[in-house]
């Protein structure tokens, strides 16, 4: 009875289990009842990094100097080339497909340390009481406005991305002659 599953490093084809090609090699022909899987090494500037049945190897990544990229680690038949950025520049992602002078801190984050020639911008989340509403490579988190010091009240709470909104004190004088004490509307006035 033909197999329905194969062992590790094998694949099922034409009701039989064939060996996968090892990393660094591509498939030329599947095995048969009488022959083993035929594999060939990848060419120069090509690679395959897994046990596979690929008929084509992948091209090594090109580190484009026009994008500020240079080779950090040359590729082999089993590994891709690893790119990095020119000195003083920073990769935009783990894949390092382009370079920026320095990254910015998004809204809700402030700059903890400005970028240097060797290290990129270091961001930190804005703690309670602070906010940042911009993307920046130099601005820290700003403290929420203190409404009290302006003789105002908080109308809308602040977040890590927005400042508080202050507004006038919505209050009435106490009609009971309470020495000019300010009483919130609807309190102590007999209003429902």
């Amino acid at each position: 009875e033909p197999p329905t599953a194969c062992r590790e490093k094998q694949y099922l084809i034409n009701s039989q289990c064939c060996s996968l090609c090892q990393p660094g090699q591509k498939l030329v022909s599947d095995c048969t009842e009488f022959t083993e899987t035929e594999c060939l090494p990848c060419g120069e500037s090509e690679f395959l990094d897994t046990w596979n049945r690929e008929t084509r190897c992948h091209q090594h990544k090109y580190c484009d100097p026009n994008l500020g990229l240079r080779v950090q680690q040359k590729g082999t038949s089993e590994t891709d080339t690893i790119c990095t950025c020119e000195e003083g520049w920073h990769c935009t992602s783990e894949a390092c497909e382009s370079c920026v002078l320095h990254r910015s801190c998004s809204p809700g984050f402030g700059v903890k340390q400005i970028a240097t020639g060797v290290s990129d911008t270091i961001c930190e989340p804005c703690p309670v009481g602070f906010f940042s509403n911009v993307s920046s490579a130099f601005e820290k988190c700003h403290p929420w406005t203190s409404c009290e010091t302006k003789d105002l009240v908080v109308q809308q709470a602040g977040t890590n991305k927005t400042d508080v909104v202050c507004g006038p004190q919505d209050r009435l004088r106490d009609p009971g002659g309470g020495g000019g004490r300010l009483v919130p509307r609807g309190f102590g006035t007999g209003d429902p």
């Epitope: 026009n66 994008l67 950025c85 920026v100 910015s104 911009v134």
Partner: nanobody, 116 residues
Amino acid sequence: EVQLLESGGGLVQPGGSLRLSCAASGFTFRDYEMWWVRQAPGKGLERVSAINPQGTRTYYADSVKGRFTISRDNSKNTLYLQMNSLRAEDTAVYHCAKLPMFFEDWGQGTLVTVSN
């Protein structure tokens, strides 16, 4: 295509002044944080100064605080760096940069030489 064209560099004596300009095109200048970055001969990049899109907040490296002033004119799409009390160690190529600044948009810069 982003273009940043720096000008205003030159040879100046220690203690002298220069005003650098950066004419920007290919992007909405008023929406971007802008930077001045310099590179002294044989040295790495040094971030000198920055300004927010509205021109209301600025940053200065300790090495230039009190001597340099960054400003911008959003109506003219131009960034400025006023440099006073110049020192020999300010000698460098000065580049303006937007945020984010991609390598391919990096300009030639303008050379400032401070020497007797």
